[in-house]
């Protein structure tokens, strides 16, 4: 499914003010000692990932047990493991309490900017999509993904941070922007809305899609997320739509199927590991890009967001369960977590293809009014 | 010291039974997913079954799916592998194995224990 | 027959360096998987030699390294040393038969 070229579709903005952004990307992992070297991390020592930071929660320091030896993913070792294989998890484990940033929520007090100065950034994100406006750049080439293809064992930690659906990514999953711009992948996490309610954050011409998928890495040239926040590519989320097809999404049953053992907050499940490329369009030479942020606090800036041209298919119970299962705090249902677009600033949002050429018969002569920024660097 | 130590081998007759366990010692037993793989005589290495951390899942191989069952008991750092229906050609060194580890495969092997089917 | 192929035997004189290949298909190796290698000397358990397609664990000689490439793997020893002399084998995931397989394995002779 290729994005449509939608109606200004008034926004659903789902009960998200303009700064629900939950914590920068959702969770991302806190500080965890290292495991001993004879005890690599075991599949159950996956860290929830529940908490990577802002895009639904950002690491905080905290020390854990050797026994648990589960190093986090902004501890990865190098290639060559000087010791028994250790296993170094995206460990996302913090201590709620303690972090100023996990006290918000979508909507109403308090205000994101309180919980963080970021959230009133200039640049953040999510925002509205205009092909027409978007600026062809032949420098973007296809999206590179290396180890996204997970055996069943070890099982990876799906949980129910409060804002959104986590699941937890074991370390070895690379992913290219292009030359040089190498990521690993920390976490996936959804976006959605409520019945008859769409839940996307980006939006396409005003038309907000049923639900986003944000797979969230950082740059190998950062060994933590802490010091990769707030720095120009230091984070990179890929993102795509989901849409309502007629048939069931089996890569993506695989995790909602098991939804209702974790409908509590805060509950987590362990889940086999799955094909996570199968979670995404199958298209990776056609996508937007732009520089935003976290859609969560702490909504840390220089964020590469690339938004999938090419929708995924998920068919009406799958969406359905999805926006109906889950329980956010306070006794509500976990539904439109989403953050309300933000406004470019003047940031240009750049496409892989001339995504301004309408294929309809019927278009107009196209008019690209922005030009590519990048020049392949 | 990390260590998988095995015990339960042995003579059986074809259609027999037999329990093999595989004590684990000094890491966080239940966490970690664990394995059975078996070696023929003169033969290569042959992956039995599977068990995530919490014992919830499990997986077999063709050959004996259906026969054997993996379980594991995280409360004595204990994992077992019960083989019913017991063949000729199920005769082999039977290892336990900690893993599959996030990307390290089969990271700890026990000694091994030989199970021989024959009348 | 093995999933994934390594010929029978591979000789070689001390000092000398050797690979020992391993071919999968589209549904383990090329797929994606990881794939480890695992040292059997005579009488013993396996141990694992690399991890991961080209990691050494700790307390492995630099002279073992590895690589990966499409639908298969190659393990290389340089420098042979006498006490290399065992059997090697490649293991992977393969999602079509939802198994962890292993190579058919590779004796090792140092002449």
């Known amino acids: 499914q290729r994005l449509p070229r939608m109606q200004e579709d008034s926004p659903l903005g789902g009960g998200s003010s303009g700064e629900d952004d939950p914590l920068g990307e959702e969770d991302l992992p806190s500080e965890e000692d290292s495991p001993r070297e004879e005890d690599p991390p075991g599949e159950e020592d996956l860290p929830g990932e529940e908490d990577l930071p802002g895009e639904e929660d950002l690491p905080e320091v905290k020390p854990k047990s050797e026994e648990e030896g589960s190093l986090k993913l902004e501890d990865l070792p190098t290639v060559e493991a000087p010791g028994d294989p250790q296993e170094p998890q995206n460990n996302a484990h913090r201590d709620k309490e303690g972090d100023d940033q996990s006290h918000w929520r979508y909507g109403g007090d308090p205000p994101w900017p309180r919980v963080s100065p970021a959230c009133a950034g200039r640049f953040q994100s999510p925002v509205d999509i205009r092909p027409q406006l978007a600026a062809f750049c032949p420098a973007l080439r296809p999206l590179e993904l290396l180890g996204f293809q997970l055996p069943p064992l070890p099982e990876l930690r799906l949980r129910n941070n409060g804002h959104s659906v986590q699941l937890t990514l074991p370390p070895g999953l690379e992913m290219a922007l292009g030359p040089g711009r190498e990521y690993r992948a920390l976490q996936l996490h959804l976006h959605w809305g409520a019945a008859g309610r769409p839940g996307s954050e980006h939006t396409v011409e005003g038309h907000r899609f049923p639900a986003e998928i944000h797979v969230v890495h950082l740059s190998t040239a950062f060994a933590r997320v802490d010091e990769a926040l707030g720095r120009p590519g230091g984070l990179a989320v890929l993102a795509a739509f989901l849409e309502e097809g007629p048939e069931e999404n089996s890569a993506y049953e695989q995790l909602l199927s098991r939804l209702e053992e974790i409908a509590e907050e805060g509950s987590e499940t362990q889940v086999p590991g799955l094909d996570i490329s199968a979670l995404l369009p199958s298209d990776f030479s056609r996508y937007f890009q732009y520089e935003g942020s976290l859609t969560t606090p702490p909504c840390a800036q220089g964020v590469i967001w690339t938004v999938f041209n090419q929708t995924v298919m998920l068919s009406a119970k799958q969406l359905h369960t999805l926006s109906d299962t889950l329980w956010g705090p306070g006794d509500s249902r976990l539904q439109l977590n989403f953050r309300a677009t933000q406004p470019l600033n003047g940031r240009v949002i750049e496409a892989s293809f001339p995504a301004g050429v309408d294929s309809s018969p019927r278009a107009a002569e196209p008019v690209q009014l922005n030009s590519c920024l990048a020049a392949g660097d | 010291q990390v260590q998988l130590v095995q015990s339960g081998g042995g003579l059986v007759q074809p259609g027999g039974s037999l329990r093999l366990s595989c004590a684990a010692s000094?890491?966080?037993?239940?966490?970690?997913?664990m394995t059975w793989v078996r070696q023929a005589p003169g033969k290569g290495l042959e992956w039995v079954s599977a068990?995530?951390?919490?014992?919830?899942?499990?997986y077999y191989a063709d050959s004996v799916k259906g026969r054997f069952t993996i379980s594991r008991d995280n409360s004595r750092n204990t994992l077992y592998l019960q083989m019913n229906s017991l063949r000729a050609d199920d005769t082999a060194v039977y290892y336990c194995?900690?893993?599959?580890?996030?990307?390290?495969?089969?990271?700890?092997w026990g000694q091994g224990t030989m199970v021989t089917v024959s009348s | 027959q093995s999933v994934l192929t390594q010929p029978p035997s591979v000789s070689g004189a001390p000092g000398q360096r050797i690979t020992i290949s391993c071919t999968g298909s589209r549904s383990n190796i090329g797929a994606d998987y990881d794939v480890h290698w695992y040292q059997q000397l005579p009488g013993t358990a396996p141990k694992l030699l690399i991890y991961?397609?080209?990691n050494r664990p700790s307390g492995v000689p630099g002279r073992f390294s590895a690589s990966k490439s499409g639908t298969s793997a190659s393990l290389a020893i340089s420098g042979l040393q006498a006490e290399d002399e065992a059997d090697y084998y490649c293991?992977?995931?393969?999602?079509?038969?939802?198994?962890?397989?292993f190579g058919g394995g590779t004796k090792l002779a140092v002449l």
């Open positions: 000094e890491f966080t037993f239940g966490t970690y997913a």
């Open positions: 194995a900690r893993g599959p580890v996030l990307r390290y495969g089969f990271d700890i």
């Open positions: 991961a397609n080209n």
């Open positions: 293991q992977s995931y393969d999602s079509s038969l939802r198994a962890w397989v």
């Open positions: 068990v995530s951390g919490s014992g919830g899942s499990t």
